[in-house]
């Protein structure tokens, strides 16, 4: 027995039924992507990392989900302390607020 057609990657088993006239076949099949690959064509890659290149996990669709305190397309931009002046403060670590020269205070304001 042979089956022709698209089977999308999924964790679920699919039941396929086939009647050849001589015999009736019923079988279960599933297609899974290799580790860290996602999507219908398994053509999306996501592997969690927490380093210079980014701080993220991966959701079930292979999208990067930034760890708490990080943002940006690659999750490598820290979210500063709430209230930190966008003009006179900045941060390289989440929750931080480093003041420009000549400015001070908890929020560099």
């Amino acid at each position: 027995a042979s089956h022709s057609g698209m089977i999308n990657p999924s964790r679920q088993w699919q039941t396929l039924k086939q009647n050849t006239g001589v015999a009736h076949f019923e079988y279960q099949i599933r297609v899974t992507c290799d580790d860290y690959y996602y999507g219908f064509g398994c053509n999306k890659f996501c592997r969690p990392r927490d380093d210079f290149f980014g701080h993220y996990a991966c959701d079930q669709n292979g999208n990067k989900t930034c760890m708490e305190g990080w943002m940006g397309p690659e999750c490598n931009r820290a979210i500063c302390r709430q209230g930190c002046s966008p003009k006179h403060g900045s941060c390289k670590l989440p929750g931080d607020c480093r003041c420009q020269y000549g400015w001070q205070g908890l929020y560099c304001d």
């Epitope: 290799d34 690659e74 931009r77 390289k92």
Partner: antibody
Framework: QVQLVQSGAELKKPGASVKVSCKVS????????IHWIRQAPGQGLEWMGI????????KYNQKFKDRVTMTVDKSTSTAYMELSSLRSEDTAVYYC?????????WGQGTLVTVSS | DIQMTQSPSSLSASVGDRVTITCRTS??????LTWYQQKPGKAPKLLVY???ILAAGVPSRFSGSGSGTDFTLTISSLQPEDFATYYC?????????FGGGTKLEIK
């Protein structure tokens, strides 16, 4: 469209420094890191380092660590690579490139010739 | 540093041939591997990233496979425009390094 435009060819004497620029357009400059790669005549590709364009933090190939400096000017969306104490072996085409999962966008290359 | 061993260093083939280039790394890099094509006087062009994902606009005759330490770039049916030099590169850890290149020539 995304473009990375590099500065022109340079002729330098041994011991001098060179600063190559890479001006980007077509996307938010601080969203993606910039890498620098070089290629000596008839040779392969050599990764020099990466700069986080948002913070200006760099990571260098140890081979160049004491001689290379990568910087950015966010106001002009330009990345710079400066290589000091030049020697003849530094004669190469220097490329800037954008990306994390491979370099989809490259500058046109800058030929740096080191000769006395 | 992670060493990249690319083979063969040069290869002669004919239009229509199936060609395979391999890249072996000195340690596990998962799927952090990229393949490039370079023609004389031009910047490299991205072909495949994350070991097996075809870059936008790249013909389907190119394919990548492998994970861990062993990787392959395959061209299923060589076209005249495919004669060039091919490089693999890892982007797992610093420094990112390139293979030595494979020069693909017309037989």
């Amino acid at each position: 469209q995304v473009q990375l435009v590099q500065s022109g060819a340079e002729l330098k004497k041994p011991g001098a420094s060179v600063k190559v620029s890479c001006k980007v357009s077509g996307y938010a400059f601080t969203d993606y890191a910039i890498h620098w790669i070089r290629q000596a005549p008839g040779q392969g590709l050599e990764w020099m380092g990466i700069i986080n364009t948002y913070y200006g933090d760099s990571k260098y190939n140890q081979k160049f660590k004491d001689r290379v400096t990568m910087t950015v000017d966010k106001s002009t969306s330009t990345a710079y690579m400066e290589l000091s104490s030049l020697r003849s072996e530094d004669t190469a085409v220097y490329y800037c490139a954008r990306g994390y999962d491979g370099f989809a966008y490259w500058g046109q290359g800058t030929l740096v010739t080191v000769s006395s | 540093d992670i060493q990249m061993t690319q083979s063969p260093s040069s290869l002669s083939a004919s239009v229509g041939d199936r060609v395979t280039i391999t890249c072996r790394t000195s340690e596990n890099i998962y799927s952090y591997l990229t393949w490039y094509q370079q023609k004389p006087g031009k910047a490299p062009k991205l072909l495949v990233y994350n070991a097996k994902i075809l870059a936008a606009g790249v013909p389907s005759r190119f394919s990548g496979s492998g994970s861990g330490t062993d990787f392959t770039l395959t061209i299923s049916s060589l076209q005249p425009e495919d004669f060039a030099t091919y490089y693999c590169q890892h982007h797992y850890d610093i420094p990112w390094t390139f293979g030595g290149g494979t020069k693909l020539e017309i037989k």
